[in-house]
Each structure stands twice: as C-alpha cells, then as structure tokens.
Interface confidence: medium
C-alpha cells in the first residue's frame, strides 16, 4: 500500500474530523465521574476505576485494552495512630497539636477514605528538638544558613515552606544539613493569591488546607525496591535499607493555621532578608528554638506511617497502526490521586478519555492511524512515577526500538491564562504549526489562533513573535520515556500568568479541596480550556501517528544546543583563572555543536527532496528522526544518577521539577569554588565536557547520509 492508503480520507480531513469530535461537555462529564470519591494508588477504589476505564476504552473502539499490574512500595498513614506535630513544654506535656485532617469541603463531609495529609515514604519517628526556619529549604537557603549565618541545623527539626522546588529536594537538603525532622507548610505568600477567596468561595488555600506529596529522591529509579527492572511476580526485591531514594528522617506537612502556631514563637536570628519572609503574622525568625518566655518549649513530631508493597494497575489501550504498526506513539497520564484529584490528575484523565473516544469514533468509521497509538492510564504517579516507570522497564526493549514519541497528560490546567508547553526541541515546529491551526479560547482573542494568544501572553525570551517553550524536567510520567529511554516527549496544559501570580503551582494542589467544583466553578466553567488542551495533546498525537514524515525538525535541536553550550560556557567562565590553570576548554563541545548544526541542515534539505513514495527510503529517514533523541542517551547515565541518561537534559539536581541543560557539566561546575580538591573537581568538569561533546557529535552522525 502507498502511505496514504491506510487512511480513507485525506490527512487534513482526518485531523479535522478528530478535532471536531472532541467535546467540552464530554470532558466535563468525565471529570465529574472521575472525581466523586478518592482514587489513592493501591486502593480498591482506584482498581475499580482502572476496570471502568478499561471497559470504556473498549467500548470506545480500541483494538485491545489490558491491565498491567505491579507490586510496588507505597506508603500510608497508620489509621489508628495518626501523624501530628506538638509543641511540648519542659515537662514533656503537649501544649499544642497540629490538626489531624483537613476540614472537608462542602458536600464531601460524609466521604470515607480521605487520606489525611502526610508525606509519603516518611520513616516513622518521634524526634523532638528546637526548630530552625529554613525558608524554601533550597540549596541556596542552606548555603545562606550555614555559610553566611553560621546556623547549624544538626540535630534540629527544620520547618520549610512549600514552593519553588520539589519537596523531595527540600528533604534531601535538610538531611544533608543534619536535621532530624522536617515540617513542610504552605505559606500564604506562595499559596494565597491576592484578591481571590479561599475555597469554597474561591480557588485559594484555606488555613486548614494541606499539600500532600511524596518526598522521595528516586532519580528516575521507579519502585524503590526494584530499580531498573519491573516489580513483577518473580521480582527480586531489595531490603528496605537498600531501597532507592527513601528519606531517613521524619517529615510531615501542615497548613498555615498550624504553621502560624509554630512560627510565631520563633527566636534566634532574624530573617536574613525580605525573601525569607512570607505573609503570616510572624517575625520569620530563623531560630534555632523559641524566643524568651518560650525557650524551654520544644517541637515534637509523631510520625507512624508505614511502607507497604502494594499492587498497582496501569490501563494500556492499543489502536493498531495500519502502515507502521511497530512504531508507537504514546499518550499517557496518571489516574491515581491524593484525594479527589479535581485538577491533578483527573482534569488530564478526562481529556485523555475524550481523546480516546474521538479516535475510537474515527476507527469505527473505518479509519486507522498510520502508526500504532498506545494510550495509558498510569497508577501510582503520586508515589514516584511508579506505574509508568515499571511499565517502561518491563517493555524497555520494545520502546527503545519502536518508540516514536510520548505525550504526557497529567493536569490539563494549573490556571486559565495561557498555554504552557514543555517538550523536546524536535517537537517545536509541530507545536507551532498545530497551535496556528487551533482557535484561541482566550477572552479578547476571539477569531484568533491559539498560537497568537499564546505568543502574546507568553513570548519567547529569545525569538520575537514566537511563544515560550520550556525544557522538560521531571516530576511527571514522561520521565522514564525521555530521561531514561530517549523517546521524544512533550506536555501541554493551560497555566496561570506567571508575571502576576508568583505563588507555587496552584494553591489547592494536593489538598482535599481539589474537587470537581473547584474546576467547574472557578477555573473553567465552560471547559473551553480543557477542550483546547485536548486539541493540543490530541492534535500532537494525531500528527505524530499519522504524518507520512515524522513532524520532527532536527534543526531546532541545533539551535538549542548552541544556546546551551553558550550558557554552560559562561557559567564556567566565572572561574577564568581555574580554567587556565587546569586547561579547561569547551572547543570540543562547540565544534560538535557546529558539526551537528551543519549535518542537521543537510538532513533537513534531504528530507524536503527524497522520494516519499519509496517506503524503504521513507522508513529510513523516519528512523533517523525517531532515533535522534535516542542518540543523546549515554548508557552509563549521569554521575550517581544511572537512570538519568539523557546528556542534553536532566532534572535539576536541586529541583526535580526543573530541567537542566548539559546537566553533567552543570553539576560538575556547581559550587566548584567550595570543593576541597579543585584539581579533581576541574578534572570532572573536563570529563563532562568530553562526554557532552562526544554525545553531540555521535548524535550528529546519526543524521549523516547512511552511505
């Protein structure tokens, strides 16, 4: 068959038919259905939802829908022995206790199985001691405390505000500083947007609201007991002492009512500057310990959570490709939630459901995609991306040979201001072209394209007339596909105005107040932003699965490689004397980037001219495009992070959510002036430049003419 014969209508017509079939009303209905009870990973309720989704995807018309189960390490509070924090007096009497649960939102008072706020994977313990306020507990916050203020956190309980960086990094930093416990809290400065009411009257965080979340430092390992391999029936499991990424000190989250009680008595040093002050009526003193009259009082944590090997269930749906069934385009998002999951994840799951329904409708009318589309409803994302990672570990050989692209589909919204896209540079042109074809849902942009409103509201810092597209970091289910396997990946959602709303994430993130009503009343009453996100995610999947030539532009990788090389070079040049002393040169990297640019340019020219009716040549060119992302994978991984193998991008070592470019070089240079052995440190910089230069050159050569 010629490449178009698989589809009985023209590709343009297909895309339009697919997009036109997506309906806001359906997304709304699916969101309601998915959010009426909690769907915590490892629970019966989430298993039942998996079976419901399996059944509905079959009804929608997918060729097959299977459950893939794994037995992974999860963490739960002890039902009879709740977690809390106390202030104790000199006699050991508890004179204040933090709340045991969040006040339930209106209409949900009688819902059972709402897991109380906890930090998943916290070890048990009842440490007591003086409190130290550590701001956001970022690397730079601990530098400020230890180096500038000479405050020692060893043996102290630290209290840190949520925001800016992944909570697992905060805990890791506290451990390294010698703390014996961590209290995490949501400060109104970060989780209460000015001019907006608290839930249930608005989308702000009430004082009793608390953010749940895992505090692991997995670095891409998946199940802590089976790193690198699937947690199947015959798995060999590590002992808990050898488990990957578990915290070693007790951790617990609280809301700002309770935080006020802990922080208002703080004594010791004043905050170093205004960036350490939040919005509570407290001095934000750093400590250690309480002031004057209260100096004999201590803080005590009571943590009794347990880690348990528990069965989880992914739902994997297949729509077989008509021409290239051995090429996989994957759309995946998680199903498990901390409580109701009104935004995270069900605003994403509802969109995936509607995309599956639309694809199924086309299939029932006789259409098939050119390539196979896999749909996934991942479990246990909230516990460390476990469902997606275990499935990818189980299917790694197929994925590394057949994986074309992965599109992530967690929360569809974190605001309602404009589009936000993070993706591989290979997808930039795909995203630009697609958004030019879609209508903007934004007020004031009626009749204009999504590209236009997005570019106006979120302009690229480098290229005028283009929108900002960010680097992929982690903290979501694309991690294993992109960072470990080197499969081109992307994600899209509607976001807030970062210029005017500086709070971290959205205020009700991972709280009991993340309900259907939150979305329907305050974020997207018409579900028009959800529909737009469905069009973007679905449109990307459609193009990736159906275009004759893969919609990847390797020239965009060349542009960013140059930008990243310039950036890392300028960081290194902050140490000109050492670069001279240790003969540190970036020439090899710049040379490799230059070669990549030239080869990518020639490849793109050939891509315009080759005979697309020749299936062998077409497949050859497409394979070069598909395997380009794979070529950036170093099989040895990054130092101390074997499952982060992408040489161009990795999650930041200081914030899992953020992407870092040339992470090997970046980490080698980080805080290099404080290293005890500068010769060794600069030697590692040189080694990392060598690895990066080699990898870029090797990737370039995959785009050269094959013979």
């Amino acid at each position: 068959k010629s490449s178009n014969e698989a589809t009985n209508i023209t590709p343009k017509h297909n895309m339009k038919a697919f997009l036109d079939e997506l309906k806001a009303e359906n997304i709304k209905k699916f969101l309601y259905n998915f959010t009426q009870i909690p769907h915590l990973a490892g629970t019966e309720q989430n298993f039942q939802l998996a079976k419901q989704i399996q059944s509905q995807w079959k009804e929608f018309g997918l060729d097959s829908v299977e459950l893939a189960h794994y037995d992974v390490l999860l963490s739960y509070p002890n039902k009879t022995h709740p977690n809390y924090i106390s202030i104790i007096n000199e006699d050991g009497n508890e004179i204040f206790n933090t709340s045991l649960f969040e006040p339930p939102p209106p209409g949900y008072e009688n819902v059972s199985d709402i897991v109380p706020p906890f930090s998943a994977f916290s070890p048990q313990g009842m440490p007591e001691g003086d409190l130290v306020y550590v701001n956001y507990a970022r690397t730079e916050d601990f530098f400020k405390l230890e180096r500038d203020m000479k405050i020692n956190c060893s043996g102290k309980i630290v209290i840190a505000r949520y925001g800016k960086v992944f909570r697992g990094n905060k805990v890791k930093n506290a451990q390294l500083a010698g703390a014996k416990g961590v209290i995490l809290y949501s400060d109104p400065a970060d989780y209460f947007a000015p001019g907006v009411k608290s839930y249930p009257d608005g989308w702000n965080l009430p004082g009793g609201g608390v953010q749940r979340g895992n505090i692991l430092n997995l670095n891409g390992a998946g199940d802590p007991l089976t790193p690198g391999y699937p947690a199947n029936e015959y798995a060999y499991r590590r002992g808990i002492a050898e488990a990957v990424g578990l915290p070693s000190i007790p951790v617990h989250p609280i809301g700002y009512y309770d935080a006020q009680k802990l922080l208002e008595k703080m004594g010791g040093s004043a905050p170093p500057d205004s960036s350490w002050r939040g919005s509570l009526k407290v001095p934000y003193n750093v400590g250690p310990g309480f002031t004057g009259n209260f100096s004999t009082q201590k803080v005590k944590m009571h943590i009794h959570s347990t880690n348990e090997v528990t069965r989880i269930y992914n739902v994997i749906g297949t729509l077989r490709g008509a021409v290239e069934p051995d090429r996989y385009v994957i759309l995946g998002g998680h199903r498990d939630s901390w409580v109701f999951g009104g935004i995270d994840p069900q605003s994403g799951a509802a969109v995936v459901h509607e995309i599956v329904r639309s694809f199924g409708t086309l299939k029932k009318e006789g259409w098939r995609p050119r390539r196979t589309i896999l749909f996934a409803s991942w479990d246990a994302e909230e516990f460390g991306l476990l469902g997606s990672t275990e499935w990818a570990e189980e299917n790694s050989r197929l994925l590394q040979e057949r994986g074309v692209a992965y599109i992530n589909a967690d929360s569809s919204i974190e605001g309602n201001y404009t589009l936000r896209v993070d993706c591989t540079p290979l997808m930039y042109s795909l995203v630009h072209n697609l958004t030019k074809e879609l209508k903007s849902p934004d007020e004031g942009f009626e009749g204009k394209s999504l590209y236009e409103s997005w570019t106006k509201k979120s302009p690229s810092p480098e290229f005028s007339g283009m929108p900002r597209i960010s680097k992929l970091g982690s903290g979501n289910d694309f991690e294993v596909f992109f960072q470990r396997l080197g499969i081109a990946s992307g994600r899209a959602r509607y976001t807030k105005n970062w210029e005017t709303n500086k709070f971290s994430g959205y205020p009700l993130y991972h709280s009991v107040y993340e309900t259907y009503e939150l979305v329907e009343k305050f974020y997207d009453p018409m579900f028009k932003y959800h529909l737009t996100v469905a069009q973007v995610r679905g449109g990307m999947v459609f193009e990736l699965a159906n275009s004759i030539v893969l919609p990847f532009d390797c020239r965009d990788y060349a542009v960013v490689l140059r930008k990243y090389a310039d950036k890392i070079y300028s960081i290194s040049m902050k140490h000109p004397q050492e670069m001279k002393t240790y003969s540190v040169s970036f020439d090899s990297l710049f040379s490799a980037v230059k070669n990549f640019t030239e080869i990518a340019s020639k490849f793109s020219e050939r891509l315009q001219d080759f005979d697309k009716s020749n299936p062998i040549v077409l497949r050859m060119m497409n394979d070069q495009l598909m395997f380009l992302e794979r070529a950036f994978i170093d099989p040895l991984g990054l130092p101390d992070r074997p499952f982060y193998r992408h040489v161009i991008y990795a999650p930041s070592s200081h914030n899992k959510y953020a992407g870092e470019s040339f992470p090997g070089i970046y980490d080698a240079l980080f805080d290099i002036e404080s290293k005890v052995d500068p010769s060794k440190a600069w030697g590692e910089v040189k080694r990392q430049i060598y690895v990066a230069a080699f990898t870029v050159q090797a990737a370039a050569e995959t785009l050269s003419e094959v013979a």
Epitope: S99, P188, F192, P194, G195, K197, D201, G208, L280
Partner: antibody, heavy 122, light 111 residues
Framework: EVQLQQSGPELVKPGASVKISCKAS????????MNWVKQRPGQGLEWIGR????????NYNGKFKGKATLTADKSSSTAYMQLSSLTSVDSAVYFC???????????????WGQGTSVTVSS | DIVMTQSPASLAVSLGQRATISCRAS??????????MHWYQQKPGQPPKLLIY???NLESGVPARFSGSGSGTDFTLNIHPVEEEDAATYYC?????????FGGGTKLEIK
C-alpha cells in the same frame, strides 16, 4: 502595620440615609473580607454583613437586608456602609473589621476600626 | 442562625485569681477537628480586640494568661492570673456559617 480608619460621627434625621467609610492600609485590601458590626449603647455586638473588595461579593445578616448596603473602592482601599431609612433603633456605633488570611470562611476578625457613632434624632 | 449564649453575664474576680467565661452554641461549630469559635475583649470606648481564634489559638501579642478551650457546642475562655488591665467585656463569636453571631458578652470586674 494594618490600620482601619473610620469616618467621623454622624447626626442624622429619621428617614434619612448615611454613608460611613473605613479606609484600610498596611495590607492587601482586596484580598480580605471586610465585616461591619453594630453596637448599640450598652449592648452587645451584632454582625451586619461583609464584602470582598476584589469582586464586590457581599453577604448580609438577614436582619440588615434592605437597611445596610456594603460597597468598596479598591483604588482608595476604602469600604463603605450606607444605612437607609434611619430610625432611632439605628443609633449605634458601627465598626468595620477585617478578616484574617482565610478570607473569612473560617476565620476571625483580627483588626477593627475605631468605630463610627451614628445618632438618629430629629 | 446559630445562637451563642454566654455565661455569666458578669463576674468579679480577685487580682491574681482565675476568671472562667463560658459560651454555648445552639449547634456544633466544630468540624474535622477545627472549632470555628473566637474570643474578643472590649474596653469602654474602644473597638473589640481579638484574643483567641479557632477556639484555642492565641492571637499574636496577646498575653499567655489568656487561653481558650472546648469543641462542639461548649467553649471556655480562661484568664489566669487575672490582672487589673483585664477589666473589660468579653465576647465569643462563631464563624462556622453565615450569619456570624456573637454571644451577649460577659463583663469582668476586678475585685
């Protein structure tokens, strides 16, 4: 420092209306509910209602519906209460009071104006 | 509406002794471990001043001799040891639902 400065005393005739003001400073005016409370001489406190300046949302005690009208001007960070069809039972001191962080859904009134005395007399 | 009943209407306490004021709500103002009950102090010619929020939390700047307790419908404000400057009228108020309502007040006199 948070401050609520209320307008001065009013002497008004029965049947007339009066509009008293409460100028806020030292915090984000739009972001907190502003409450109004009545206190008759030698009596207790009565909650009249509240306004959310950011969007003008109001809630009233049923007893004061039609009697009190709450408004707010974000540009001047000032809340207003208009009292209409005044009679002798409306003679009282009226306080404005801000709600703490939680937007007043579950929270207390943490800062109060000094009060405005309204006397209804012919 | 939730009716708040304070008792006693007035009391006289010797300097250094304990003053106990009770407040009963006509229905529970506690949900999920939070009690939406607050206490205020008012001196003649002054606006009320917040002392205790959410039943037991001391407002910053308020002396530690003030404490609050209770849940459900029954709440108590304790002052110990009473000082001269504590002579005032004390009010309880709930914020469980709309409308907000206050207790009738308790006048504290120092003997």
């Amino acid at each position: 420092e948070v401050q609520l400065q209320q307008s001065g005393p009013e002497l008004v005739k029965p049947g007339a209306s009066v509009k008293i003001s409460c100028k806020a400073s030292g915090y984000a005016f739009s972001s907190s509910w502003m409450n109004w409370v009545k206190q008759r001489p030698g009596q207790g406190l009565e909650w009249i209602g509240r306004i959310y300046p950011a969007d003008g949302d109001t809630n009233y005690n049923g007893k004061f519906k039609g009697k009190a009208t709450l408004t707010a001007d974000k540009s001047s960070s000032t809340a207003y209460m208009q009292l209409s069809s005044l009679t002798s039972v409306d003679s009282a001191v009226y306080f404005c009071a801000r709600c703490g962080w939680d937007g007043g859904v579950y929270y207390a009134m943490d800062y109060w104006g000094q009060g405005t005395s309204v006397t209804v007399s012919s | 509406d939730i009716v708040m009943t304070q008792s006693p209407a007035s009391l006289a306490v010797s300097l250094g002794q304990r003053a106990t004021i009770s407040c009963r709500a006509s229905k529970s103002v506690t949900t999920s471990g939070y009690s939406y009950m607050h206490w205020y102090q008012q001196k003649p010619g002054q606006p009320p001043k917040l002392l205790i929020y959410l039943a037991s939390n001391l407002e910053s700047g308020v002396p530690a001799r003030f404490s609050g307790s209770g849940s459900g419908t029954d709440f108590t404000l304790n002052i110990h040891p009473v000082e001269e400057e504590d002579a005032a009228t004390y009010y309880c108020q709930h914020s469980r639902e709309l409308p907000r309502t206050f207790g009738g007040g308790t006048k504290l006199e120092i003997k």
